[in-house]
């Protein structure tokens, strides 16, 4: 079998809301992946599991199941959203993200994603991780290629 390539493209959008009383930040982060099938047969993308870390702490997890089929020598672009919560021991971030005196409230988040593919009863896992700046001070749409949005997300328990 030839390779299945997974390329993390980046953050497509980040939508933010706050709970002032709990000093909590809620960030819904949509990421974009390119999955390329270099084989001469179709490959099933069984699931995508993702997590987001801030300062070595996992702040959000998500899992997409039964996603799509990628034809021979084809590529698909997939969006997935990870709901994240920055709270408690990270609640000092609330001050920064809501600070009016600065324009861009960039924080550095670690995006981790694992794609599980299947073909002829064989499963393969490919993982990627990348640090990304995300603006926690406003809703932001980042300039990435257009892609289909797969809203079959189930936040992990």
């Amino acid at each position: 079998p030839r390779s299945i390539e997974v390329k993390y493209i980046g953050v497509k959008s980040a939508y933010v809301s706050y709970d002032a009383e709990k000093r909590t930040i809620y960030l819904n982060i949509t990421n974009t992946l390119n999955i390329t099938n270099n084989n001469y047969y179709s490959v099933e993308v069984e699931n995508i599991t993702a997590q987001v870390q801030f300062s070595k702490t996992v702040i959000g997890k998500a899992r997409l199941n039964n996603i799509t089929n990628i034809g021979p020598l084809d590529m698909k672009q997939i969006d997935y959203t990870v709901p994240t919560v920055i709270a408690e021991e990270m609640s000092y971030m609330y001050d920064f993200c809501t600070l009016l005196s600065i324009k861009v409230h960039n924080i550095v988040l670690m995006m981790q994603v694992t794609v599980t593919t299947a073909y002829f009863g064989h499963s393969e896992q490919i993982s990627q991780e990348r640090y990304q700046y995300v603006d926690c001070g406003r809703n932001t749409t980042y300039q990435l290629a257009q892609s289909e949005y797969l809203n079959v997300l189930q936040p992990q328990q």
């Epitope: 000093r23 070595k56 408690e88 021991e89 609640s91 000092y92 971030m93 001050d95 920064f96 960039n106 924080i107 550095v108 640090y131 700046y133």
Partner: antibody
């Protein structure tokens, strides 16, 4: 306004231990990490560790793990640092500070610890 | 541990001149850097947080720039009250180490 109050000086005998205090006021004590920093005369700043009063969780610089113990008393909004087995190398000013994202905006005045027989 | 290399170690500058202090970091810390000013017998004072943002009450002649491994603090039109020692500090991972300091003296 936010204030972190520290005693001006502490004298300690070699081999003994000392407990430094940092009393916070003007904000909700349990919401912010308190960090401790050492400065020896003519030297730079060394990060010792920090503690989150809301949970008691703490982080230490490996260099200070056997020397410093960080605690808090939430009822009095006070952070403490216990320094054991004092030697002349421990003679320094010790600052407490309140953590924010990307910096420490609030500092105590510092406590000068003098280790002397 | 992350190493912070600050330069120069000291400099003597006249009032009205412009000064740039640099901080080189041993690994990519993105924007996780602060700058402080410390005067003799005083606590450090936060000048810049998250690499480029001025702290409350800090005059606009101060500015921070850089990201990744190279950072700088610039002071335009130096005033006599700007003397003291300047430190950078990273916030990427514990321990949050400081630079060795730059002593700024007014000519």
């Amino acid at each position: 306004q936010v204030q972190l109050q520290q005693p001006g000086a502490e004298f300690v005998r070699p081999g003994a231990s000392v407990k430094l205090s940092c009393k916070a006021s003007g904000y909700t004590f349990t919401n912010y990490w308190i960090t401790w920093v050492k400065q020896r005369p003519g030297h730079g700043l060394e990060w010792i560790g920090d503690i989150y009063p809301g949970s008691g969780n703490s982080n230490y610089n490996e260099s200070f793990k056997r020397k410093a113990t960080l605690t808090v008393d939430t009822s009095s909004s006070t952070a403490y640092m216990h320094l054991s087995s004092q030697t002349s190398e421990d003679s320094a000013v010790y600052f407490c500070a309140r953590k924010a994202y990307g910096g420490f905006p609030y500092w105590g005045q510092g406590t000068l610890v003098t280790v002397s027989a | 541990d992350i190493q912070m290399t600050q330069s120069p170690a000291s400099l003597s500058v006249s009032v009205g001149e412009t000064v740039t202090i640099t901080c080189r970091v041993s690994e990519n810390i993105y924007n996780n850097l602060a700058w402080y000013q410390q005067k003799q017998e005083k606590s450090p004072q936060l000048l810049v947080f998250a690499a480029t943002n001025l702290a409350d009450g800090v005059p606009s002649r101060f500015s921070g720039s850089g990201s990744g491994t190279q950072f700088s603090l610039k002071i335009n039109s130096l005033q006599s009250e700007d003397f003291g020692t300047y430190y950078c500090q990273h916030f990427w991972d514990t321990p949050f180490t400081f630079g060795s300091g730059t002593k700024l003296e007014i000519k």
